[in-house]
Amino acid sequence: MAVTACQGLGFVVSLIGIAGIIAATCMDQWSTQDLYNNPVTAVFNYQGLWRSCVRESSGFTECRGYFTLLGLPAMLQAVRALMIVGIVLGAIGLLVSIFALKCIRIGSMEDSAKANMTLTSGIMFIVSGLCAIAGVSVFANMLVTNFWMSTANMYTGMGGMVQTVQTRYTFGAALFVGWVAGGLTLIGGVMMCIACRGLAPEETNYKAVSYHASGHSVAYKPGGFKASTGFGSNTKNKKIYDGGARTEDEVQSYPSKHDYV
């Protein structure tokens, strides 16, 4: 019962997380114009992974897509890639986990197969969550770098007269959505992996017991009734779990110019 609950909850948490990752990827507010300590403008700028937008006081909003691939910063491309990989892995993970759910019966699927699928989907969710967190963090790092760069030369004047106030960008709502969604997907994946342990049929290794019948000696080895599951011995199970723990990607982020509009 606890295993079913853990698996079901893991699935639901991951589903919410992946929906959040998709939402964050599509959102336009990855970076928003910094209003703090800036002259109040009648125009508000914000940018996403796919387009930049301008909202006027009049209520009119104009968005322009980045209709170039080669002209965009490598970091932005990397963030796009991480988010898409996260979505794809998460979507596959969801598909696999639906069939792995204990409460859903598909033909004569054995528990061992469900355990395998639960573990696979769990690993996929973990990697998906890590991709989203990494993508959002790389973008956030890029923003911080550019924020301080633009603060350093915020007022570029000629002859002492201020000419330009450079638009500074700060964290947009999509970053927070992405971080939370990535975290939820990660937690969901961990829950699926935990549920997998409970689903795995453990082979009970009894010591061989000798029954001495009159006249001749026959040795019975009980416990072989679970051998038909095809899941292998406990030592083999442990190997699978160890493999699942080695999925963390180390992502290093480097400062990059973010002004891609």
Epitope: Q33, P39, V40, T41, A42, V43, N45, Q47, S52, C53, V54, E56, S57, S58, G59, F60, E62, R64, V162, Q163, T164, V165, Q166, T167, D259, V261
Partner: antibody, heavy 118, light 113 residues
């Protein structure tokens, strides 16, 4: 046809209060902001502030904070400019104008002349 | 506040002449997000409310004769009337439509000989 029709001329004494109206027609009133502009006799245009009838948000120019209040009534499609504790320097023509995209004032009221005199 | 400086304060021309008036802002009115200059030009004839001529520094409002042209970027802007007509007698105002308060210039008074 889009129109902004303002209330008639006002003659007031210092210290009194006046409320100028600006009735909009020909468009959805709540979709566009209303700006107020002051023009003293023989002088240029001075932006006073604006109101967003959709959200009720108001923005005032620094010199028009305090005695000046912008309000609106959606059911009447009307924006209002109220000036409290009138002073002689409030003598001017007050215009309302619709805020359209490009942050431009595309339609203007005919103007309301306010005279403050003791 | 953003200061809008218009020059000349007044000019007298004969009908058919080309006229140019300048408007300078104390800060750039160019928005990096959409590469548009938030500067607007208005025409005010005696006893009338102002009329919108040009927005986004160079986009002519519908119904405005094509003899009116707006140009410039950043802090320096120009309104050109290619062939002045008698009905163009008015005061022309430029306005900052980017920063609050949305300040106007002092105006350029156009008189016809």
């Amino acid at each position: 046809e889009i129109q902004l029709v303002q209330s008639g001329p006002e003659l007031k004494k210092p210290g009194e209060t006046v409320k100028i109206s600006c009735k909009a027609s020909g468009y959805t009133f709540t979709n566009y902001g209303i700006n107020w502009v002051k023009q003293a006799p023989g002088k240029g245009l001075k932006w006073m502030g604006w109101i967003n009838p959709n959200t009720g948000e108001t923005t005032y120019a620094e010199e028009f904070k305090g005695r000046f209040a912008l309000s609106w009534k959606t059911s009447a499609s009307t924006a209002y400019l109220q000036i409290n504790n009138l002073k002689n320097e409030d003598t001017a023509t007050y215009f309302c104008a619709r805020l359209y995209y490009g942050n431009r004032f595309d339609y203007w009221g005919q103007g309301t002349t306010l005279t403050v005199s003791s | 506040d953003i200061v809008m400086t218009q020059s000349p304060s007044s000019l007298t021309v004969t009908a058919g002449e080309k006229v140019t008036m300048s408007c300078k802002s104390s800060q750039s009115l160019l928005n990096s997000g959409n590469q548009r200059n938030y500067l607007t030009w208005y025409q005010q004839k005696p006893g009338q409310p102002p009329k919108l001529l040009i927005y986004w520094a160079s986009t002519r409002e519908s119904g405005v004769p094509d003899r009116f042209t707006g140009s410039g970027s950043g802090t320096d802007f120009t309104l050109t009337i290619s062939s002045v007509q008698a009905e163009d007698l008015a005061v022309y105002y430029c306005q900052n439509a980017y920063y609050y308060p949305l300040t106007f210039g002092a105006g350029t008074k156009l008189e016809i000989k």
